[in-house]
Structures are given as C-alpha cells and as structure tokens.
C-alpha cells in the first residue's frame, strides 16, 4: 500500500530587516544542485536561532524562496543565489512558498516535485464536524449542572 502525501501550497510576502548577524538562514538548491527532483528552486534548509528570520517567525525550513526584492530566483546557480541574498541590502523582501503537509492516505503517491494541494473542504469539513460535536458536548454538560 503506497502512502499519499498531499499539500496545501500557499505564498507569502515576508519583509525582513537585516539584523546584526544578518538574515539568519541557510539555503540549498539551484540549477547546479537540485534539492528537489526536477526543481532547481532555492529552499530554506536552516533557520538560525535568534536571527532576523527566526525572530520574525514566518519563514520555515523547507520553504521555497521564489524571489528576493522582486528578483526571480528561477534558473540560478547556487552561488548566484547566495550572492543575491548577500547583496540584498538592509530591508529584504522575500516571496515565499510554504507547503503544509496535511494528510497521509492509502492511495497513490504524489512526488516532491508536484506541488498540487488537497482541496480545502477536505480540511474544513472534519474541523467543522469536531467543532459541532464539542459544542454539543459542552451544552449537555451545562444542562447537567
């Protein structure tokens, strides 16, 4: 039985101010060293403690960085991507793709290179049902007091 991995893919603009020790994260990827199969994008491999990214809290390990200060990171050599970050200045705007793994199921397998997301109702319906059950249980409990 193959496990199925599904993702919610969201994009976010993150504005960081370079701190005393810099932006505070590491990257992998690039056209010369693909981190994800069939994807030469740039990914966050490490968030450093107490760095600007860690203190901001939005950037996560595993995030894909799409652009830096409006400059696309597609088809860049790894070194060129590093240079771009290091020369980015004091205020740095990152366009980031988050991928939230939301379900493991028994059918098929979706590879890392395929960012297709699970339909949102598949997440919301169980959450709504749980909320209703909790509310009903609370009302019953209050009636017994």
């Amino acid at each position: 039985m193959n496990g199925r991995v599904d993702y919610l893919v969201t994009e976010e603009e993150i504005n960081l101010t370079r701190g005393p020790s810099g932006l505070g994260f590491n990257i992998v990827g690039g056209t010369d060293q693909q981190y994800v199969s069939n994807d030469s994008g740039i990914y966050v491999s490490r968030i450093k403690e107490n760095g600007a990214a860690a203190l901001d809290g939005r950037l996560q390990e595993g995030d894909k960085i799409l652009s830096v200060n409006g400059q696309d990171l597609k088809n860049l050599l790894h070194q060129d991507a590093v240079d771009l970050f290091r020369n980015a200045g004091y205020a740095v705007s990152l366009r980031v793709q988050h991928r939230l793994q939301v379900q493991n199921g028994p059918i098929g397998h979706r590879g890392e290179g395929d960012p297709s997301g699970i339909p949102i109702f598949m997440v919301l319906v169980p959450v709504f049902a749980l909320t209703m059950v909790a509310a009903w249980a609370f009302m019953r409990y209050r009636q017994q007091l």
Partner: nanobody, 130 residues
Framework: HVQLVESGGGSVQAGGSLRLSCAAS????????MAWFRQAPGKEREFVAE???????????WYVDSVKGRFTISRDNAKNTLYLQMNNLKPEDTAVYYC?????????????????????WGQGTQVTVS
C-alpha cells in the same frame, strides 16, 4: 575540536605573490565553512575570503571587495587544507593572516561572513608587503 595551522607567510615586494595554506584536523573537513581573516598593526581583524562546501557537491566562495580579482580561496577536502592564493600584493595587504573554521553543513548561509560566526581559529601567519 578543530585544530588549524597556517603556513606560507613571508615578505614580498609589491606586485608579488604568496600562497597561504591552512591545515585542519579534528573534524570532517568537508563539513567546515572556512575563511581567511587578517589583522594589520593597530587595526581590527577583518574578513578577507570565505569558502564553504554546501554538502551537495559544490563549493561557494565570497571575498571582501578590496581583494576581489587578486586573491583566490580554495580547498582540498582530500588533504584537509584551505588555501589563499594572493597575487598582485599591495603594501596595504600587510597583516597577520588567520585561518578560521565553522561547522555549517546545512546548506549555505545567506549572510555575509562575520567574525562571531567562526568557532575555531589558527595562530596566524605574517604577510609583509613592501
């Protein structure tokens, strides 16, 4: 712990060349981010050049603007050695040159090098340009 021993310093005329070496022991060399710093008399220690092995089969390099095009940093993982080839030396390159190392094998840092990033230091080798 990492031990670093520099060699190759000396006196040279302006326009000349020197090659510094830094032999490392005590830890897997390929997992170390390596750099050269220098300290001129009466001045603070400053960054010169950096080399890292990003764990995916490639090296990364970074230089301070004042040495770009003149200095080349490289490493030989098989020999556990870091090098700094210095060409077209100028009197302002006179300083004690230090090798430094930091364990950082999870990709490449997006931040310019900082002294405080480096955990291990050599004793230094004197370079004098007249």
């Amino acid at each position: 712990h990492v031990q670093l021993v520099e060699s190759g310093g000396g006196s040279v005329q302006a326009g000349g060349s020197l090659r510094l070496s830094c032999a490392a022991s005590g830890r897997t060399f390929s997992s170390l981010r390596m750099a050269w710093f220098r300290q001129a008399p009466g001045k603070e220690r400053e960054f010169v050049a950096e080399n890292w092995w990003n764990g995916q089969g490639g090296q990364g390099v970074w230089y301070v603007d004042s040495v770009k095009g003149r200095f080349t940093i490289s490493r030989d993982n098989a020999k556990n050695t870091l090098y700094l080839q210095m060409n077209n030396l100028k009197p302002e390159d006179t300083a004690v040159y230090y090798c430094a190392a930091h364990r950082d094998d999870s990709g490449s840092t997006v931040d310019p090098p900082n002294q405080s990033d480096y955990d291990y230091w050599g004793q230094g080798t004197q370079v004098t340009v007249s």
